[in-house]
């Protein structure tokens, strides 16, 4: 089902004695209580894995954590989508699967996490120090990314938490704008409620419905989502970019994704009924890029089968424009 | 409203080679990836392959390889399918079909394009 | 390759009456099957994706349902307009392929 952070519709107290003044100094402080408590940052996690059975076969796992509808996750290696990068599979929860050599086999494993078997021999397969990275596109929150890979001391059959290097683009400039935005916000709440327990209370006229209190959202935000922002550094190694890649067929995924079935409010059927998956160690790294949906409300100029925005499929190798995927 | 507009009939001689195209307006051309599918008369469909508008990008059908050859014109929006070393066997109607991410939906489709090959 | 069959290959109806169609996937492909419309001397539409998700505008007489290799396609009180062959096709990976279609036909 489809969650969003709503603002909740308040109902103050009828002014009394401090009129319209009154009535804003007590609206405003449950607004900001309501931005302050749902600010969490979603997080994506990514699994590097190395078959214990064929050296050269890789699962990559990942997942979001966050409040969010998915609606498109793109998963890459040789760096971020859009940097370099080059599409392994893209998986949209109702539109379907597509996938590229040498990924394999790629599927939902529940509502918000993904996993990816890559095999191949020679030039097309992956080894050891391979970055890979997933990308999640999600109604609020946006899209983000992530990127893991195995140490090259790995033992096969075990799983690596990927390195945590967060990926930032220019679209860091929006989230650092809004962090502000909520920071002044909740400095200025805690303001407001300190000069009100300075003052005497107003006597307000007895309402026939109580004051309703900010619901905050279903899933509390992690300590690492609301620690501070890392300097940003991505661990992008391409000594190990498949060698058939001029002449390999896959389509690169969109450099940026807002796709959302507008008809749409149920997720697929998937494998194993979305049955939960254990999320790995903190390692796994978590992203600070977030792509706003500037248009998420927008209809497109056409009717499309349940389509109201589609990004620009940047291919694997087309680099055009900064967020072109190579 | 979104338009994919095909070229009109052909007939070809077996061994000929035939160019068709698929024009696409009222969309991003490059949103969408262009799907090629072949209708035998009376017949099914099967899907011969997909081109990336973006990098030229392409996938092919098994069957298809070494027989199809898609190209893409961004500047006039345009797809094009050539069909080489022709035979009675790919005597049908041939449509353009546009699918939006991932790439595995044909979300419109053009009027179709009848081959006939025939000496 | 996932090989589609679908059943029947063709189907006498009038209009008014229910019918159903149905397509079994070589392997599980989850919930990721759509279902296609072509009337004679036209081009194919998309109906139905996902098993049941309606494309915008297809009436709610069409319903799909189905998971992993079975699936279905009901039309409910037949209308003039729903004559024509039906297709399914897998949406999960490439190459996309078909079933070999269902022709409904007023009886």
């Known amino acids: 089902m489809r969650t969003e952070a709503q603002v909740p519709a308040l109902q103050p107290p009828e002014p009394g004695l401090e009129g319209a003044m009154g009535h804003r100094t007590l609206v405003l402080p449950w607004v900001l209580l309501t931005l302050c408590v749902t600010a969490g940052t979603p997080e994506v996690w990514v699994q590097v894995r190395m078959e214990a059975t064929e050296l050269s076969s890789f699962t990559i796992r990942c997942g979001f954590l966050g409040s969010g509808s998915i609606s498109l996750v793109t998963v890459s290696w040789g760096g971020p989508n859009g940097a370099g990068g080059t599409t392994l599979a893209v998986l949209h929860p109702e539109r379907g699967i597509r996938q590229w050599a040498p990924a394999r086999q790629a599927r939902w494993e529940t509502q918000s996490s993904i996993s990816l078997i890559l095999e191949g021999s020679g030039a097309s397969s992956p080894c050891a120090n391979t970055t890979f990275c997933c990308k999640f596109a999600s109604f609020p929150e946006g899209s983000w990314e992530a990127c893991g890979s195995l140490p090259p001391s790995s033992d096969p059959g075990l799983s690596a938490p990927p390195t945590p290097a967060p990926i930032l683009r220019a679209d860091l400039a929006g989230i650092l704008g809004v962090s502000g935005v909520l920071l002044f916000g909740c400095v200025y709440l805690l303001h407001l409620l300190r000069r009100h327990k300075h003052r005497p209370a107003p006597r307000l006229q007895p309402s026939r419905t109580s004051p309703q209190a900010p619901r905050a959202r279903a899933w509390a935000p992690s300590q690492a989502s609301q620690a501070a922002l890392h300097v940003p550094y991505a661990t992008i190694n391409t000594s190990c970019r498949p060698a058939t890649l001029d002449t390999a067929h896959p389509h690169g995924g969109p450099s940026w994704w807002a796709s959302l079935p507008t008809h749409a409010a149920h997720r697929p059927q998937g494998p194993a009924a979305w049955a939960s998956t254990p999320i790995p160690a903190r390692g796994s790294f978590v992203s600070v890029e977030n792509g706003l949906y500037a248009q998420a409300g927008e209809r497109p100029p056409h009717t499309g089968p349940g389509l109201t925005l589609f990004p620009d499929p940047r291919g694997p190798r087309a680099m055009e424009g900064p967020l072109g995927v190579r | 409203e979104v338009q994919l507009q095909q070229s009109g009939p052909e007939l070809v001689k077996p061994g000929a080679s035939v160019k068709i195209s698929c024009k696409g307006s009222g969309y991003t051309f490059t949103d969408y990836f262009m799907n090629w599918v072949k209708q035998s008369h009376g017949k099914s469909l099967e899907w011969v392959g997909d081109?990336?508008?973006?990098?030229?990008?392409?996938t092919y059908s098994q069957k298809f390889m070494g027989k199809a050859t898609l190209t893409v014109d961004k500047s006039s929006s345009t797809a094009y399918m050539e069909l080489r070393s022709l035979t009675s066997e790919d005597s049908a109607v041939y449509h353009c079909?546009?699918?939006?991410?991932?790439?595995?939906?044909?979300?419109?489709w053009g009027q179709g394009t009848s081959v006939t090959v025939s000496s | 390759d996932i090989q589609m069959t679908q059943s029947p290959a063709s189907l006498s109806a009038s209009v008014g009456e229910t019918v159903t169609i149905t397509c079994r996937a070589s392997e599980n492909i989850y919930s990721y099957l759509a279902w296609y419309q072509q009337k004679q001397g036209k081009s194919p539409q998309l109906l139905v994706y996902n098993a049941k998700t309606l494309t915008e505008g297809v009436p709610t007489r069409f319903s799909g349902s189905g998971s992993g290799t079975q699936f279905s396609l009901k039309i409910d009180s037949l209308k003039p307009e729903d004559f024509g062959t039906y297709y399914c096709?897998?949406?999960?990976?490439?190459?996309?392929?078909f079933g070999a279609g269902t022709k409904l036909e007023l009886n």
């Open positions: 079909a546009a699918s939006g991410p991932p790439y595995v939906l044909l979300d419109y």
């Open positions: 096709q897998h949406h999960y990976g490439t190459p996309l392929t």
């Open positions: 081109i990336n508008p973006n990098n030229g990008d392409t």
